[in-house]
Amino acid sequence: SHQVDSARSASLAYQNAVTAVSEGKPDSIPAAEKFAAENKNTYGALASLELAQQFVDKNELEKAAAQLQQGLADTSDENLKAVINLRLARVQVQLKQADAALKTLDTIKGEGWAAIVADLRGEALLSKGDKQGARSAWEAGVKSDVTPALSEMMQMKINNLSIGSPSRLEEELRRRLTE
């Protein structure tokens, strides 16, 4: 049917656009941007996610945020919206837009997202200098239905608040040196 054919061609166009971007082909980013702009659907939103990741990798954070906001407008799928909003909040924290990040996180509903939202909320609050708020967010996250790894990480962040947190970089270096 026409519907099946158009879905198949949209899927193929999406695959082509995203594969070209991930392989770093010349002119692939403008082509993917065009695809995302023209496809106001799940494929467009997924293309925006991939593009945003490329922009983050190139440290073009403003572009990444704009692309993610475009992706949000393109889909009605709640889970996909949650993933996009999480990425957006991370980028906003990096852009020192903590209040915007907190607003973004407030839009993510559903028990399944509670722990990862709590982790990011803590990071956003800490970036504003609100240590007590960060502690409360992480404590709530630890109590939620959370994977052991994420729970442990948030507990470590709580502990670090009281001992003058070593930088995330140093934590990562320590981890890698013992791998």
Epitope: V56, D57, N59, R87, R90, V91, V93, Q94, E123, S167, R168, L169, E170, E172, L173
Partner: nanobody, 122 residues
Amino acid sequence: EVQLQESGGGLVQPGGSLRLSCTASGVTISALNAMAMGWYRQAPGEERVMVAAVSSRGNAMYRESVQGRFTVTRDFTNKMVSLQMDNLKPEDTAVYYCHVLEDRVDSFHDYWGQGTQVTVSS
């Protein structure tokens, strides 16, 4: 985009010393100074592992197996990192890679040099 150029590998006898150096380009001093700089190594048939690093705060950190034998130093003003390797052992034989680690909040980003061969053999 950070580019890394190593120098100083070679062949050395067990118990000997070597010094590796690495200079970064394509990045401002202030941007690089917010990143960690250090060294990884990859022995034949093994995974690449971090050996030593200097954080953005200037703290030197080491893998346990090289502690006391290797010294990592970082020159923040000249975008350089060096690895002084003393009392070398045959198991230190590997390709050594200069490495920069950037914290991008939602992920860590790695930059690598081309690698320089260190062979410890009598």
